[in-house]
Amino acid sequence: YDFTNCDFQKIEADYLRTISKDLITYMSGTKSTDFNNTVSCSNRPHCLTEIQSLTFNPTPRCASLAKEMFARKTKATLALWCPGYSETQINATQAMKKARKSKVTTNKCLEQVSQLLGLWRRFIRTLLKKQ
């Protein structure tokens, strides 16, 4: 999906109002220094591409974050503010819902969510630079 035509201001508002709180709740008990940020992004569409990938694409050591509250809110936000996102992406993530068996917050998942927080912060920074 090409995130170029998204309403970035509205996405930022949703992130600051609600998604960020859920990400921080997920990370509770860990320190910001526990993980190194290895994933980066260069502009707003690129940041959203990386956020989409890290949130919804399962990895071997963190099967799926897609059922977490922050992920559901991310999906809702992208559906609202990125025209065409729903049609191209929602069906693709339904299979991941089914793949998830039990809710286990592994260290790898915490690391992945730490990367997500970094990407979101980068998204906000690139937004501020443009204004």
Epitope: K10, R17, T18, K75, A76, A79, L80, P83, S86, I90
Partner: antibody, heavy 120, light 111 residues
Framework: QVQLVQSGAEVKKPGSSVKVSCKAS????????ISWVRQAPGQGLEWLGV????????IYAEKFQGRVTITADTSTSTAYMELSSLRSEDTAVYYC?????????????WGQGTLVTVSS | QSALTQPPSASGSPGQSVTISCTGT?????????VSWYQQHPGKAPKLMIY???KRPSGVPDRFSGSKSGNTASLTVSGLQAEDEADYYC???????????FGGGTKLTVL
């Protein structure tokens, strides 16, 4: 069962406000969009706005901006639509409608409608 | 933010096919595949018949079909039946600011 149940008919004076409720049951309220659509007597459908409780987003039709307020109480699975500064042209049946999960612009479930009459 | 344009009326005999058009702009119908159609019988709430311009929700007969070309969407009802007599409304997503637009409605009469 899966349904939206709206509050009863209202008669209001011009200049006053009306608040209509819409109670959801049989589905996860917060995940869907709840839109409000009105229909004046003998007229077509007109969209007023939507709320997506999951992310606390509301979007209003430009025509009603500043006059309509849509809220939701997830603890009771109830959405509300308040319209202020009522005039006779606001006499209509007001429907709440469920927007599909992540496809908030398709209304696959409707309330029974609430008739709001504005008359002096 | 004007409504989508539909013919006020359409008619057909039982067993025939009838097509209702809905014309918008490149900012709504032409810009997205997010067109839906609703059926409304007198005194009743609308019912979703078509979404994503050509998909049918479960329970909607396959006599109802949707299509789209450019800025115009169409609803075709084939094998008309008496119970198809109703008002039909098209709707389109219209971007993140306007969100949803409805057509003025078409009264379908089964002769």
């Amino acid at each position: 069962q899966v349904q939206l149940v709206q509050s009863g008919a209202e008669v209001k004076k011009p200049g006053s406000s009306v608040k209509v409720s819409c109670k959801a049951s049989g589905f996860t309220f917060g995940s869907y969009g709840i839109s409000w659509v009105r229909q004046a007597p003998g007229q077509g459908l007109e969209w007023l706005g939507v709320i997506v409780p999951l992310v606390g987003v509301t979007i209003y039709a430009e025509k009603f901006q500043g006059r309509v307020t849509i809220t939701a109480d997830t603890s009771t699975s109830t959405a509300y639509m308040e319209l202020s500064s009522l005039r006779s042209e606001d006499t209509a049946v007001y429907y709440c409608a469920r927007g599909q999960e992540y496809f908030y612009w398709y209304f696959d479930l409707w309330g029974q409608g609430t008739l709001v009459t504005v008359s002096s | 933010q004007s409504a989508l344009t539909q013919p006020p009326s359409a008619s057909g005999s039982p067993g025939q096919s009838v097509t209702i058009s809905c014309t918008g702009t490149s900012s709504d119908i032409g810009g997205y595949n997010r067109v839906s159609w609703y059926q409304q019988h007198p005194g009743k709430a609308p019912k979703l018949m078509i979404y994503e311009f050509n998909k049918r929700p479960s329970g909607v007969p396959d006599r109802f079909s949707g299509s789209k070309s450019g800025n115009t969407a169409s609803l075709t009802v084939s094998g008309l039946q008496a119970e198809d007599e109703a008002d039909y409304y098209c709707s389109s997503y219209a971007g993140t600011d306007i969100f949803v637009l409805f057509g003025g409605g078409t009264k379908l009469t089964v002769l």
